[in-house]
Each structure stands twice: as structure tokens, then as C-alpha cells.
């Protein structure tokens, strides 16, 4: 079952800044992302930012830059400009919308444990420390087992010169003792990405995520909606209207890494214009 | 939450007319844009006509001039005319509210959709 997940951090340098990460775990491509606060969308929240993976987005205040991390993921940096900071017990939600298969949204608040007169605010979360750990933690292991290896070697050319056939189980001996310590790296010599591959990287990335990228674990509610449906065209947004001057079937350009199959146009006969109106159903 | 029912769908011989309806409960906050998408079975589904928070209706060509949208805000119905019907307009027609990007139209919410057939 596709599932959302959300975090709420509070920024180290600024503790009037906060940032809300979400992420989709499914499969399926997203075709927009709802971000609200106060409750979820469409029953009293309010929106702080709308997604698309192809058309960009859209940001109320107090959102100061919202934005994609992933295929899959997005994150919302607010400025709380009042003293109280009014967001360390707000409700912030996200809503993954697949059209027309379904939406799933979930909702998340800033952990009592990062308040800021409690304890510091949490560190972001760790996806490319791990991938940096693993670095660290196999260039570590190579240069022990290298030195290590070097370090016998000089010790045998410093001994007085055995005879010409050393005992079957010395060479043994020191074959282990040499590469015993880099035993883990070795496989990562064959296979440089086997070690590098943090728990936040799915295993099959085909299988996981077909667009490869890292996800989260997450406790999720959804709303399923719409019957089954899927597709996939080289043209620009998933479930969206274009309006264009002469109406023409055209390709706007290339394609940003963001898949989304399936788009239609739309004449205008006024132009290209950007409505920041409001359609309120009540 | 937002609940959007359509209705009017059912088979009609090509040439024909169908009324679709909408009626749009809930609230959708800051949402700009109210359209028809249709799927057809085995092909690529496609916007069918939208209405800006301007009032200003917008058609996908293959539908201009046979297909007029409109909408009741007393009763917080959208609808959408079908006349001249042909079998490629076979489709389950679902009605959407949406966000603007631009002249986009992406939908945010939908109903489950009614079914359209266009067949002699």
C-alpha cells in the first residue's frame, strides 16, 4: 500500500525556520503535492505550498521556498516570523496525488523533544550521511587492510632469508593475516556500489523506486480514489490542461528528470497568464 | 474532505447529446481550477475542458464547438454539454478541482468518474 510520511525540523542556525520533508513510498508517478498546515487538505487546513513534477510550484506564506528532493519527495522551508513561533505546534500535512489512481495524505508536527527551550534542534535527516558514512567507513577498512598488508611485507624483507621452500602453512598463515582485516572491502572492489548503498537506498532500485531514489519509512494514512488507471506519453504534466495561443499540439521543450506521462493543451485565446485566484466548493 | 459525484454518463448513439454533473461538497482551499479529464479505454487520458476561477472555459480541440462546461455556484455543480458525440469520445469522464501553474489546470482532487459510451 502506498504510504506518505512527513518530518518536521526546526533549523540549527535559525530557530525561527523550520522545514517539513515529505515523501512518497509507492508505486506510481505523483502528478501534484499538497502541503497544508492546520489540519489536512480540504478540512481546514490551509495550504502552504502546491507541487507539480513538471510545472513547478506554487507557495503561500509563510513559505519561503518549497521544492523537490527527490522523485518522490519534497520539502517546505517556512519562515515563522512571529516571537511565540506558532509552528512548533502546528500540524503540517502533505497529500501525494496520482491522478487519477489515487491520493494519499499524512500528517506530522515538530517532535516535542526539538523545542527549542527543551533540548538543540534535531539534525536534518541523515540520507547522505549514511551514503557518506559507507564512504568513509570502506576507504577506512581499504587503507587499514592496505597498511596492515604493508606492514607484513616490510616485516618479511627485514627477516634473515629462509630457505627456499617456507612451510606450506606460513604462506597460509600470512595470507590470512594480511587480508583478513579487508575481507569486507574485497567485495567492493568487485562491486564498488555494494557497500555504498546505505538502509536508505532500496536494495533493487527497479524494484523500490523505479526512478531510483532513496525513501523513508513512515506511518501513513490514505485515501484511495479513482479506479486503476495508468500511462505514459513524451509530452510534459500527468493529468493537467495547457493553454497555448494556436492551439497546436507542441513539445515544450525537454523533459526535466521528473517523469509524468500525459498531457493535453488548451487554446487561450488571451495568452499565457498565471491566475492566483481562488475556487472555493463549500 | 472534498467529495466530488458525477453523473449523467450511459450509452448514446454517435450523433447524440449527454449532460454530465457534478456536484462538489467540502471545501477546497485556495484550489483555482474545475475541469473534465476523460480516460478511454487502452489510450492516454486527456483534459477535456476546464473553467478558471475567472470564469473563463477552456476546450481541448478535439471537443470545441460540440462540448460547452459551465458551472452553478449556488449549487456547487460543474457540468459539462456533450452534443455531436462520436465513439472516440468514449471515455469514463471525471471531474476535477485543481491548482493553476500558469494556464495548466492539475488536478487535486476527483470523483470516481462516470462512464460514457458512444456506440451504435
Known amino acids: 500500500t502506498p504510504e506518505v510520511w512527513v518530518q518536521v525540523q526546526m533549523e540549527a542556525t535559525e530557530l525561527s525556520s523550520f522545514t517539513v520533508h515529505c515523501g512518497f513510498l509507492g508505486p506510481g508517478s505523483i502528478s501534484l503535492v499538497t502541503v497544508s498546515w492546520g489540519g489536512p487538505d480540504g478540512a481546514g487546513g490551509t495550504k502552504l505550498a502546491v507541487l507539480h513534477p513538471e510545472l513547478g510550484t506554487r507557495q503561500w506564506a509563510p513559505a519561503r521556498q518549497a521544492r523537490w528532493e527527490t522523485q518522490s519527495s519534497i520539502s517546505l522551508a517556512l519562515e515563522d516570523s512571529g516571537a511565540s513561533s506558532p509552528f512548533a505546534n502546528t500540524t503540517f500535512c502533505c497529500k501525494f496525488a496520482s491522478f487519477p489512481e489515487g491520493s494519499w495524505e499524512s500528517c506530522g508536527s515538530l517532535p516535542p523533544s526539538s523545542d527549542p527551550g527543551l533540548s538543540a534542534p534535531p539534525t536534518p535527516v541523515p540520507i547522505l550521511r549514511a551514503d557518506l558514512a559507507g564512504i568513509l567507513g570502506l576507504s577506512g577498512v581499504l587503507l587499514f587492510g592496505c597498511g596492515y598488508l604493508l606492514h607484513l611485507l616490510r616485516r618479511q624483507k627485514h627477516r634473515p632469508t629462509p630457505r627456499l621452500q617456507p612451510s606450506h602453512t606460513n604462506s597460509q598463515a600470512l595470507t590470512a593475516q594480511a587480508w583478513a582485516p579487508s575481507q569486507a572491502s574485497q567485495a567492493a572492489l568487485h562491486d564498488p556500489y555494494a557497500t555504498i548503498n546505505t538502509s536508505f537506498c532500496p536494495a533493487t532500485l527497479d524494484t523500490a523506486h523505479p526512478n531510483g531514489w532513496a525513501s523513508l519509512p513512515t506511518h501513513a494514512a490514505h485515501q484511495p480514489q479513482g479506479p486503476a488507471a495508468s500511462a505514459s506519453t513524451p509530452i510534459l504534466a500527468r493529468g493537467s490542461f495547457v493553454s497555448v495561443e494556436n492551439g497546436l499540439y507542441t513539445q515544450a521543450g525537454e523533459r526535466p528528470p521528473h517523469t509524468g506521462p500525459g498531457l493535453t493543451l488548451f487554446p487561450d485565446c488571451r495568452g499565457p497568464r498565471a491566475v492566483e485566484g481562488r475556487f472555493g466548493v463549500r | 474532505e472534498v467529495q466530488l459525484v458525477e453523473s449523467g454518463g450511459g450509452l448514446v448513439q454517435p450523433g447524440g447529446s449527454l449532460r454530465l454533473s457534478c456536484a462538489a461538497s467540502?471545501?477546497?482551499?485556495?484550489?483555482?481550477?474545475m475541469g473534465w479529464f476523460r480516460q478511454a479505454p487502452g489510450k492516454e487520458r486527456e483534459g477535456v475542458a476546464h473553467i478558471d476561477s475567472d470564469g473563463i472555459p477552456r476546450y481541448v480541440e478535439s471537443v470545441k464547438g460540440r462540448f460547452t462546461i459551465s458551472q452553478d455556484h449556488a449549487k456547487n455543480s460543474l457540468y459539462l454539454q456533450m452534443n455531436s458525440l462520436r465513439a472516440e469520445d468514449t471515455a469514463v469522464y471525471y471531474c476535477?478541482?485543481?491548482?493553476?501553474?500558469?494556464?495548466?489546470?492539475?488536478?487535486?482532487?476527483w470523483g470516481q468518474g462516470t462512464m460514457v459510451t458512444v456506440s451504435s
Open positions: 476535477v478541482v485543481g491548482f493553476k501553474f500558469g494556464d495548466y489546470c492539475a488536478p487535486n482532487d
Open positions: 467540502g471545501y477546497t482551499s485556495r484550489t483555482d481550477c
